[in-house]
Amino acid sequence: AITEAREEAKPYPLFPGPFPGSLQTDHTPLLSLPHASGYQPALMFSPTQPGRPHTGNVAIPQVTSVESKPLPPLAFKHTVGHIILSEHKGVKFNCSISVPNIYQDTTISWWKDGKELLGAHHAITQFYPDDEVTAIIASFSITSVQRSDNGSYICKMKINNEEIVSDPIYIEVQGLPHFTKQPESMNVTRNTAFNLTCQAVGPPEPVNIFWVQNSSRVNEQPEKSPSVLTVPGLTEMAVFSCEAHNDKGLTVSKGVQINIKAIPSPPTEVSIRNSTAHSILISWVPGFDGYSPFRNCSIQVKEADPLSNGSVMIFNTSALPHLYQIKQLQALANYSIGVSCMNEIGWSAVSPWILASTTEGAPSVAPLNVTVFLNESSDNVDIRWMKPPTKQQDGELVGYRISHVWQSAGISKELLEEVGQNGSRARISVQVHNATCTVRIAAVTRGGVGPFSDPVKIFIPAHGWVDYAPSSTPAPGNADPVLII
């Protein structure tokens, strides 16, 4: 039920001339702006008898007539004070005022909740002139009211820099309950309590709430909005919604799914992005997260060579970016790789294992017993060495790389020679006489070039000197030998 506080009417002298509701039928308006048609009448409460001037803002005219009588104060007449109607209905309400003809260019503006209504509103102002006064009726119509039309409407008129304001007309749009807060989807831990909130408003109030779980009502008695439902815990997924009831009917919220957090599904599509001698870059597609964000992942690497120990290495990494570089692997080896990821509940099963291989490595040891001597008769430098003890992982030896640097009188020149795998000796032409030649040798596989041997130096004299002893790789800790021949 609507309770309306009615104002007491205060007597004011009536303006001369006709007023709305008592216009003669032969009076036609000077100006009539058509209003939108199709509205339906609504329930209206009028605080006073029609035709009385209101008690709001009043302008006292300063002008006096020929007889020097003061003009009565200007004020909007009382009209309906409170309109209650249902959503989507039409409504029309108005303000009226009688203005002495001595005032020109009077305009009436409509305001709602302190803001002027401009533009696309159906506001019509009609003027009914008489000998001394003009009756002005300002109408405002809304063809299909919405909740946003709720509020306090007033008319304003400016005369002589004075503002005349009408009493407010309260529009109350009633309808089905409107949700201001609906329950939200949640992911919850099994058998753990959680809360859902539902809030709806009228008018009309009060709004009562019923909770629904999987199509069945949870509470026998309604709760006044807002309502908080405490669910003691779930063991399986459930759908919750709430019903909001008022005198106009009921509105049902969206149904929200409450999921039970679980361990994730295993990752899928583990794939090899890149492989080197000692590392493998993998990527994977995460499985379903079990309604709980992934925290981290574990990469399990198992030696898979047919005759390997089978050692298992476990590398932990962040869940993103679904990419990991596995390091410290043996060259030319096979590995089985699986990925598992965890959320707050626990670890997923391991992905399907994939087989990956590292590539051939570069040799890890330099050639041994490098010996260099000058063969003056052929103007060559002879180099000899022993094949390094290559590990199986180093792959197949494909040859050797010989670096020889020639230094003389401030000039230095480095040359590189490639030698086949079967050799353990090489012959290089003397490049410069009266110079030092520094030789280093490295073993080469398809995996790359291994470390170079310690440098061995030999002095190449000017023509005519005699060749005797070779120069060889120094014992550890000795200075580089320089052999003067």
Partner: antibody, heavy 114, light 107 residues
Framework: QVQLQQPGAELVKPGASVKVSCKAS????????MHWMKQRPGQGLEWIGR????????NYNEKFTDKATLTVDKSSSTAYMQLSSLTSEDSAVYYC???????WGQGTTLTASS | DILLTQSPATLSVTPGETVSLSCRAS??????LHWFQQRSHRSPRLLIK???DSISGIPSRFTGSGSGTDYTLSINSVKPEDEAIYYC?????????FGAGTKLELK
């Protein structure tokens, strides 16, 4: 020290099945492949297959796919090889060995005879 | 399957001699070749892994060499306790395959 304990002998009837065990100790059971080999009297060695106790991953010699089934029991650090539908051809010494085959069991002599 | 051919099938030597046992693979096995010794009524024992890597506890007179398809086990100064059958094994691909063995006899 690393030990792989196998029963010395098993006598079974043709057509039956047998489960040969290999109990491991002295190392981390789940960190090494367990291999099984067959050696018939006066003959060479044959590789049957391997199992990884970490995840029960297996590889079999195709020749033994329908004959042997490899399993492990992590709780007791024991590997098993089940041989089915036994015939006299299955009479042999069966060895378990780990990793790079650096450690071997003593072997189980299986005799399939009625 | 990779076939391993061992030669000779039998070798008769005098203690103190040096012997070489050969193992040839039907394809390159990239040094993934291992040598075992099996004495009479005993389990096999790993002597050399990856063609030439020595094994802790194995006498230094046992050495291995080779790459690609051809591999050799050498026993320097043979001792009486070296009388056994020697097997090579490829660990390059599954199934693992053993050679037929070389029987080393002492005169």
């Amino acid at each position: 020290q690393v030990q792989l304990q196998q029963p010395g002998a098993e006598l079974v009837k043709p057509g039956a099945s047998v489960k040969v065990s290999c109990k491991a100790s002295g190392y981390t059971f789940t960190n090494y492949w367990m291999h099984w080999m067959k050696q018939r009297p006066g003959q060479g060695l044959e590789w049957i297959g391997r199992i990884h106790p970490f995840d029960s991953d297996t590889n079999y010699n195709e020749k033994f796919t329908d004959k042997a089934t490899l399993t492990v029991d992590k709780s007791s650090s024991t590997a098993y090889m089940q041989l089915s539908s036994l015939t006299s051809e299955d009479s042999a010494v069966y060895y378990c060995a780990i990793g790079t085959l650096i450690y071997w069991g003593q072997g189980t002599t299986l005799t399939a005879s009625s | 399957d990779i076939l391993l051919t061992q030669s000779p099938a039998t070798l008769s030597v005098t203690p103190g001699e040096t012997v070489s046992l050969s193992c040839r693979a039907s394809q390159s096995i990239y040094k993934k070749l291992h040598w075992f010794q099996q004495r009479s009524h005993r389990s096999p024992r790993l002597l050399i892994k990856f063609a030439s890597d020595s094994i802790s506890g194995i006498p230094s007179r046992f050495t291995g060499s080779g790459s690609g398809t051809d591999y050799t086990l050498s026993i320097n100064s043979v001792k009486p306790e070296d009388e056994a059958i020697y097997y090579c094994l490829q660990g390059y691909s599954t199934p693992l395959t053993f050679g037929a063995g070389t029987k080393l006899e002492l005169k």
